[in-house]
């Protein structure tokens, strides 16, 4: 009958405790891409740093081969931020002759691959229209949401474009998630 | 033996419970700007709300001076918003005239101050060009990540230019933190 | 005594322990919106799928007629993201002759109601202008904070034009809040 | 094979830079997953991590010192710099670089080929 | 930021012995490596990844742990083993033990 005396009326004394600290948590910053093949009709997915700098995996979360690894199921918080920089786009050049045009556009997505499933699954979209006219541009897309993840389940971040992706400083670009 | 009953087979028996209602968190919402100095190189520093309205620390959070204090280590999620507002930017002026132009910006950096460390470090950063011709504008810039902290660290949020924050209302521009 | 050998030493004895799963949580994803009247002066609330694909509740979190039901008080992260998508605006045209112009905008409003309140309260706000010329243009709006709310408190989510809501894709135009 | 040899004064006063540079052989650092790292050893001491540039032009330093260090990298030359700025007495150490590398984007960086260090020492 | 506090700091030993030394770090960890050094030598790598032997490392080395508690042991100590060792992580900012010096008894 220990060990019971702190529980609130709602939790089942079934229930596991666990200490916070002990949780699987990764944050990821961003490194320069190398040219790799991707499936086709999906975006190309990045890579990552998982220990130099800000970056860290702990507590079984594992990052390898593009591919944050869910060591246990349950509800995480998975976030990225993707900075993009380009030029001026195609888009902006027919927008000045005043034809509106399908505007040139940057997208990140959140994805998770299960290996019993034959299809990756979208979690999370960020899609932005990109038509500034005559001069270089950047500009971040962040994401953040909580989902329901099964031991085994592998997370990528995928991006419309790797070229425009801004790899230059770990605080720009970045990805992460944590068991709640 | 007892008190063990819930722990999960890959906790470590000596690891702390705590209960959640007694972590550190804080969440600091937009004031008006008084004029500062800053350091050479650094952004300027945005001061908060602390305990009026929707901003509240607890749990041995503390702000002071523009800095959120952490009292104690381990993974905390960080996060803010600021909202920018501005006139036409010279940059769009320019652009008018056809002439590719090194674009107007604005940035948002959450930084980290270590007293052991001369240097700060930047956590996040989210910076964007701007480049809207002929009109009044305004827009938010979202950052939110989780970062290893020790006792002892302090938070500041850094931006580019105090005088195009939007500091109106509370829900537009806030800073945030709490352990994970 | 028992039960409280893992309690670090700043932890009140009484303190409620609970296991993490037992928490409510939820995540809501967008459909599409039908006709409904709204409180004037208050921007229309937006309605959400809570079961199907990536969206549920759970543990006691309800959602019902637009908001989540918050069952337990505590401190909440809260976030949203809406994706918009619109046509050339007036603005743009306006700005085209070369006058300056009040910008068409896009805002998103995270809101709590609670019952003994006779007025809601504006927990978060992203605003933007929108003012792309020539185009169909199309961007998100994202929102996550930490706040402290009280058992019986609603959450929705306000936009200001419904029409513009990209409603396609799970992934796009989300809602969720956790207790931490 | 591969190779790293430190170079660099042997003697330096203090509030002085030393610059100290560590020529390589054997691999690039245009190569995927690679990096040259400095380390110190004061006599009798630990080691302590001061530096690294990877092949991708990340640099990180190390916080307690980053205001006083500066890393760069010549590929062409096979060649990775150190300076340190506002020497002092307690600087005197044995500074080693060593070879970075990793297998592939999720295993650990490694220090697996290391040159024989090269003592500093701070005196007026 | 991640400190690591090995122990013993000082371990007298004989040949034969089976020893082993820990790295305590104070915060977790994914991944820790281990470097033999002799005096006026560089340091050289033993372990890496937690368990992997490094190329031409005998095998009587080896190592585990997760989290906080990682380990090396050598099974049975030789006398070219009489050296110091560190532990090494790189997580927020590299960082070493304060080494463990292994002498003869």
């Known amino acids: 009958l220990k060990g019971q005396e702190f529980a609130p009326s709602h939790q089942q004394v079934y229930a596991p405790l666990r200490a916070d600290g002990d949780k699987p948590r990764a944050h990821l910053t961003v490194v320069r891409q190398t040219a790799t093949q991707h499936f086709k009709n999906q975006f190309p997915a990045l890579h990552w740093e998982h220990e130099l700098g800000l970056a860290f995996t702990k507590n079984r979360m594992n990052y390898t081969n593009k591919f944050l690894l869910i060591p246990e199921s349950g509800d995480y918080f998975i976030y990225s931020q993707v900075t993009f920089r380009g030029m001026t786009s195609e888009c902006s050049e027919i927008r000045q002759a005043g034809r509106p045009n399908k505007p040139d556009s940057i997208t990140v997505v959140i994805t998770k691959v299960t290996d019993s499933y034959p299809e990756p699954t979208q979690l999370l979209m960020g899609t932005k229209s990109v038509c500034e006219v005559g001069s270089n541009w950047f500009q971040p897309i962040y994401l953040g949401a909580m989902f329901s993840l099964q031991e085994g389940d592998k997370l990528m971040v995928n991006v419309s474009d790797i070229s425009l992706v801004d790899y230059t400083k770990e605080d720009k670009t970045f990805f992460g998630a944590f068991l709640l | 033996l007892k008190g063990q009953e819930f722990a999960p087979s890959h906790q470590q028996v000596y690891a702390p419970l705590r209960a959640d209602g007694d972590k550190p968190r804080a969440h600091l919402t937009v004031v008006r700007q008084t004029a500062t100095q800053h350091f050479k190189n650094q952004f300027p520093a945005l001061h908060w709300e602390h305990e009026l309205g929707l901003a509240f620390t607890k749990n041995r959070m503390n702000y002071t001076n523009k800095f959120l204090l952490i009292p104690e280590s381990g993974d905390y999620f960080i996060y803010s918003q600021v909202t920018f507002r501005g006139m036409t930017s010279e940059c769009s002026e320019i652009r008018q005239a056809g002439r590719p132009n090194k674009p107007d910006s604005i940035t948002v950096v959450i930084t980290k101050v270590t007293d052991s460390y001369p240097e700060p470090t930047q956590l996040l950063m989210g910076t964007k060009s701007v480049c809207e011709v002929g009109s009044n504008w305004f827009q938010p810039i979202y950052l939110g990540a989780m970062f290893s902290l020790q006792e002892g660290d302090k938070l500041m949020v850094n931006v580019s230019d105090i005088s195009l924050v939007d500091y109106t209302k509370e829900d537009k521009t806030f800073f945030g933190a709490f352990l994970l | 005594l028992k039960g409280q050998e893992f309690a670090p030493s700043h932890q009140q004895v009484y303190a409620p322990l609970r296991a993490d799963g037992d928490k409510p949580r939820a995540h809501l994803t967008v459909v599409r919106q039908t006709a409904t009247q709204h409180f004037k002066n208050q921007f229309p609330a937006l309605h959400w799928e809570h079961e199907l694909g990536l969206a549920f509740t759970k543990n006691r979190m309800n959602y019902t007629n637009k908001f989540l039901l918050i069952p337990e008080s505590g401190d909440y992260f809260i976030y949203s993201q809406v994706t918009f998508r619109g046509m050339t605006s007036e603005c743009s045209e306006i700005r085209q002759a070369g006058r300056p112009n009040k910008p068409d905008s896009i805002t998103v409003v995270i809101t709590k109601v609670t019952d003994s309140y006779p007025e809601p309260t504006q927990l978060l706000m992203g605003t933007k202008s929108v003012c792309e010329v020539g185009s169909n243009w199309f961007q998100p709006i994202y929102l996550g904070a930490m706040f402290s709310l009280q058992e019986g408190d609603k959450l929705m989510v306000n936009v200001s034009d419904i029409s513009l809501v990209d409603y396609t894709k799970e992934d796009k135009t989300f809602f969720g809040a956790f207790l931490l | 094979q591969v190779t790293l040899k430190e170079s660099g004064p042997a003697l330096v006063k203090p509030t002085q830079t030393l610059t100290l540079t560590c020529t390589f052989s054997g691999f690039s650092l245009s190569t995927s997953n690679m990096g040259v790292v400095w380390i110190r050893q004061p006599p009798g001491k630990a080691l302590e991590w001061l530096a690294h540039i990877l092949w991708d032009d990340r640099e990180y330093s190390n916080p307690a010192l980053k205001s006083r260090l500066t890393i760069s990298k010549d590929t062409s030359k096979n060649q990775v710099v150190l300076t340190m700025t506002n020497m002092d007495p307690v600087d005197t150490a044995t500074y080693y670089c060593?070879?970075?590398?990793?297998?592939?984007?999720?295993?650990?960086?490694?220090?697996?080929?290391w040159g024989q260090g090269t003592l500093v020492t701070v005196s007026s | 930021d991640i400190q690591l506090t090995q122990s013993p700091s000082f371990l007298s030993a004989s040949v034969g012995d089976r020893v082993t030394i820990t790295c305590s770090a104070s915060?977790?960890?994914?991944?820790m490596h281990w470097y033999q050094q002799k005096p006026g030598k560089a340091p050289k790598l033993l372990i890496y990844s937690t368990s992997n032997l490094a190329s031409g490392v005998p095998s009587r080395f080896s190592g585990s742990g997760s989290g906080t508690e990682f380990t090396l042991t050598i099974s049975s100590l030789q006398p070219e083993d009489f050296a110091t060792y560190y532990c090494?992580?790189?997580?927020?900012?590299?960082?070493f033990g304060q080494g463990t010096k292994v002498e003869i008894k």
């Open positions: 090494h992580q790189w997580n927020n900012y590299g960082t």
């Open positions: 060593a070879r970075m590398s990793r297998n592939y984007y999720g295993s650990s960086y490694v220090m697996d080929y």
């Open positions: 915060s977790s960890v994914n991944y």
